[in-house]
């Protein structure tokens, strides 16, 4: 009874040409020890033969005691509960299906695992929370689906092509589940971050270029503004007018509302990115600022200091 | 049962080569490796090689290479040691066995030999 | 290669005694994939060679319980804890771990 027998695995492992892969395996055959197990490549089954056709990658009954450092295909399991698989190095054209012909005293099953090697390393994968904010710590992460202990590789991030100063942490996980390299980086962005490129760099155990991913970060933020007066130095006499003008050099996302506070109160009737105050009185004295909101919230200038002074 | 059956002995001249069978019954011959063990009075016994029937890969020790060549008839279930330039030295008993396990490793079964004698 | 040093080489016993052989690797017999493939076999007068134990000490299914092996790196002993008149013949330990693989030069057990 063919059911008797179970798996556990990852459904595909991807790796890329002289790279290696590592296959975490589980298996359980009811009825007793495993008697031999072959590795096949793209397995056919021959209705004429009652045999599988394909290319032995590995037989135990012929590989099983050849030193480990002679194999490029390597069974790391045995012959009751561990399937494991080495392929190192592993081959473009060794994409495709990879069938465990697994034979105990009274049964036979055929396992399959998909491989998919690139002719180049393929790109890491950048995650992003789905939000960012200024001064907000956010978590980047850094996939690669794929792992090998024959071959060390790392990740690393960059900002505008500069390395980022933060410490990542980089964990992979070899397991029936999944495999995996991941490297995740808490990173507190400024608005100035707003719009550079962030790059996760997959690299060898020498650093030497692999591939990567970027992604330009989107930082949610207040309006941030300059204000400029005329004239420059913000001292006028009684009856002169003044101008003050209110630029927002980033909003993200765009403003809505423009106000002019005077003192920390509120100008009313005075919603443009200008200013004009005519024929200036001792009574306007004081600290003038723009305050621009958008769905963050509300971003001010800084301070201008106006001072009438007596005609 | 498993069952490795040797030719008969073999009187061979000085120079000559002289080429043993051993007819494997009971298993599935191709998936398991054969090797030959040589047997002189008095001298142990030494490790000539092996072949892997599936496929004809073999190994052989460094003291045999050029003196033995080993062959195998999947269809007749028959491994075949050939030995070459024969001397004195050659005469002895000459062994096939199986290695018997995927996990293990062991010479399981054994043919009952086979002698040579080198003599003119 | 690995030479394979057997002592002793004639053992005289009594039915009913211990025997022990030991087998002494010239350098380490340790397989790269972690197993050790020292096996020891008896072989008889005019008979072929019979397997005893495998991986240092497993027992051969069919093998009386009153031979053990046991052993690690480069010393192995085989113990026969009562010898018996069909144990008497020549015992052989045996690397098979790595290339060319060796045999031991033999002991003879006999009845003294």
């Known amino acids: 009874d063919s059911s008797k027998w179970v798996f556990e695995h990852p459904e595909t492992l991807y790796a890329w040409e002289g790279a290696c892969v590592w296959i975490p395996c589980t298996y359980r055959a009811l009825d007793g020890d495993l008697e031999s197990f072959i590795l096949f490549h793209n397995p056919e089954y021959n209705k004429n033969t009652s045999k599988f056709d394909g290319t032995r990658l590995y037989e135990s009954t012929k590989d099983g005691k050849v030193p480990s450092e002679q194999k490029r295909v390597q069974f790391l399991g045995d012959k009751n509960k561990n399937c494991t698989l080495s392929i190192h190095p592993v081959h473009l054209n060794d994409s495709g299906q990879l069938g465990l012909r697994m034979e105990s005293k009274t049964e036979k099953w055929m396992e399959r695992i998909h491989l998919n090697v690139s002719e180049r390393p393929f790109p890491p994968h950048i995650q992003l929370p789905p939000e960012i904010q200024e001064s907000q710590e956010v978590t980047l992460t850094c996939l690669l689906n794929f792992s090998c202990y024959g071959y060390p590789i790392q990740l690393q991030w960059l900002l505008e092509g500069v390395p980022m100063r933060q410490a990542a942490v980089t964990s992979t996980s070899l397991t029936i589940k999944s495999v995996f390299t991941r490297s995740e980086l808490k990173f507190s962005p400024q608005w100035s971050h707003h719009g550079k490129i962030v790059t996760c760099q997959l690299q060898d155990a020498d650093g030497k270029f692999l591939s990567n991913d970027t992604v330009q970060l989107n930082v949610k933020h207040t309006p941030k503004l300059e204000i400029k007066v005329t004239p420059s130095d913000a001292i006028v006499r009684e009856g002169d007018s003044v101008t003050m003008t209110c630029e927002v050099s980033s909003s993200n996302p765009e403003y809505t509302t423009v106000s002019w506070l005077k003192d920390g109160t509120s100008l009313k009737k005075q919603n443009t990115f200008t200013l004009n105050l005519r024929e200036v009185t001792k009574d306007q004295s004081g600290k003038y600022c723009c305050q621009v909101s958008n769905d963050v919230g509300p971003g001010r200038s800084e301070e201008v200091f106006l001072q009438v002074q007596y005609a | 049962q498993v069952q490795l059956q040797q030719s008969g002995p073999e009187l061979v001249k000085p120079g000559a080569s002289v080429k043993i069978s051993c007819k494997a019954s009971?298993?599935?011959?191709?998936?398991?490796?054969m090797n030959w063990v040589k047997q002189r009075p008095g001298q142990g016994r030494e490790w000539i090689g092996r072949?892997?029937?599936?496929?004809?890969?073999?190994n052989y020790s460094g003291k045999f290479k050029g003196k033995a060549t080993l062959t195998a008839d999947k269809s007749s279930s028959t491994a075949y040691m050939q030995l070459s330039s024969l001397t004195s030295v050659d005469s002895a008993v000459y062994f096939c066995a199986r290695d018997g396990s995927s996990w293990d490793w062991y010479f399981d079964v054994w043919g009952a030999g086979t002698t040579v004698t080198v003599s003119s | 290669d690995i030479l394979m040093t057997q002592t002793p080489l004639s053992l005289p016993v009594s039915l009913g005694d211990q025997a022990s052989i030991s087998c002494r690797s010239s350098?380490?017999?340790?397989?790269?994939?972690?197993?050790?493939?020292l096996e020891w076999y008896l072989q008889k007068p005019g008979q072929s060679p019979k397997l005893l134990i495998y991986k240092v000490s497993n027992r051969f299914s069919g093998v009386p319980d009153r031979f053990s092996g046991s052993g690690s790196g480069t010393d192995f002993t085989l113990k026969i804890s009562r010898v018996e008149a069909e144990d008497l013949g020549v015992y052989y330990c045996?690397?098979?771990?790595?290339?060319?693989?060796?045999f031991g030069g033999g002991t003879k057990v006999e009845i003294k």
């Open positions: 350098q380490s017999i340790v397989h790269s994939n972690g197993n050790t493939f």
């Open positions: 009971g298993y599935e011959f191709s998936r398991s490796w």
């Open positions: 045996f690397q098979g771990s790595q290339f060319p693989y060796t």
């Open positions: 072949i892997y029937p599936g496929d004809g890969d073999t």
